[in-house]
């Protein structure tokens, strides 16, 4: 039993390293960031200058596009919650410095949270997303 | 008000065996995982066994997998552990506790105990 | 031995602030969400804390707890003498497919 668990964890261990999640990273910055201009924002703020190039595509055709890719990567791990765990953390931990704001971070968070259901997979059960950056050892 | 009442402890030779039930009232049973947790004579607490709302899912600690069966009537609300093949370090307190643990995102957490019945395994 | 491990003992006078500390893994701790648990002398645990920091109803503010990394702290401030009692830590290991206790830290209130 143990001998299993270990090889599953190898396995899993070497689906995140072959998994790109970019894909679903981009999905959920452009969602949370289209959410915000739907809402409105202060048009002085420095991040509406239509000149500053962004590392988002704020373009909706990219984004579905994005969440296709993203449901691919993920869709990997459907037979393996822990490893479904390990994924969405990975997310949260690469994105939580360029998350500006406690209020982003709840909202990319929730978003996080709908991603596997999105693409029609189950979310996993006993999955802690309050990360911090850096803050996990890897097993 | 949630209740969750033990019976069925008491003391038993070495290699017996033992059906501990719990009678849960004051919340709707079917819908709660439930958790069986022990806790030997001046020592910490051990979980036991965990049983998803449907009976469809259980999870044992290694060293009772084998030995012990957790079940539950859903008509009846009550919970079971049955246990053979017992042993000496079996002898504890069982609690049987209502789990908290949710479909997604959640953790196990164990917001209602019973009282406790006592097992003690000696010859 | 358990795998959570938490200080033995700790005290500190009334009125005053405690800390306890519950260390685990990456397979444990850091990937799950730990609850702790008071249990007063000859009664049965009591749910303080669940999913790292939130209280049920009717447990007092007094009680707090957080999570960094693989390591969770249970505060209490306002030490009273009623809070004298053993407190464990629980979180699930995907590992072993089980829920963990910590080995449990006996708080005296001097």
């Known amino acids: 039993r143990q001998q299993w668990e270990l090889q599953g964890d190898r396995r899993c261990q070497s689906q995140l390293e072959r998994a790109n999640l970019r894909p679903c990273e981009q999905h959920l910055m452009q969602k949370i960031q289209r959410d915000e201009d739907s809402y409105g924002r202060d048009p002085y703020s420095p991040s509406q200058d239509p000149y500053s190039p962004s590392p988002y595509d704020r373009r909706g055709a990219g984004s579905s596009q994005h969440q296709e890719r993203c449901c691919n990567e993920l869709n990997e791990f459907e037979n393996n919650q822990r490893c479904m765990c390990e994924a969405l953390q990975q997310i949260m931990e690469n994105q939580s410095d360029r998350l500006q704001g406690r209020q982003q971070e709840q909202q990319f968070k929730r978003e996080l949270r709908n991603l596997p259901q999105q693409c029609g997979l189950r979310a996993p059960q006993r999955c802690d997303l309050e990360v911090e950056s850096g803050g996990r050892d890897r097993y | 008000e949630v209740q969750l009442v033990e019976s069925g402890g008491g003391l038993v030779q070495p290699g017996g065996s033992l059906r501990l039930s719990c009678a849960a009232s004051?919340?709707?049973?079917?819908?709660?995982?439930m958790t069986w947790i022990r806790q030997a004579p001046g020592k910490g607490l051990e979980w036991v066994a965990n049983?998803?709302?449907?009976?469809?899912?259980?999870d044992y600690l290694d060293s009772v997998r084998g030995r012990f069966t957790i079940s539950r009537d859903n008509a009846k609300s009550s919970l079971y552990l049955q246990m053979n093949s017992l042993r000496a370090e079996d002898t504890a307190v069982y609690y049987c506790?209502?789990?908290?643990?949710?479909?997604?995102?959640?953790?196990?957490?164990?917001?209602?105990w019973g009282q406790g019945t006592l097992v003690t395994v000696s010859s | 031995q358990s795998v959570l491990t938490q200080p033995p003992s700790v005290s500190a006078a009334p009125g005053q602030k405690v800390t306890i500390s519950c260390s685990g893994t990456?397979?444990?701790?850091?990937?799950?969400?730990v609850s702790w648990y008071q249990q007063l002398p000859g009664t049965a645990p009591k749910l303080l804390i669940y999913?790292?920091?939130k209280r049920p109803s009717g447990i007092p503010d007094r009680f707090s707890g957080s999570k960094s990394g693989t390591s969770a702290t249970l505060g209490i401030t306002g030490l009273q003498t009623g809070d004298e009692a053993d407190y464990y830590c629980?979180?699930?290991?995907?590992?072993?497919?089980?829920?963990?206790f910590g080995g449990g830290t006996k708080l005296t209130v001097l």
């Open positions: 506790t209502r789990n908290g643990l949710q479909d997604s995102y959640s953790g196990d957490f164990f917001d209602h």
């Open positions: 004051g919340f709707k049973f079917s819908t709660f995982y």
């Open positions: 990456g397979s444990n701790i850091g990937h799950n969400y």
């Open positions: 049983i998803k709302q449907d009976g469809s899912e259980k």
């Open positions: 999913d790292n920091t």
């Open positions: 629980a979180t699930w290991d995907a590992d072993l497919s089980a829920v963990l």
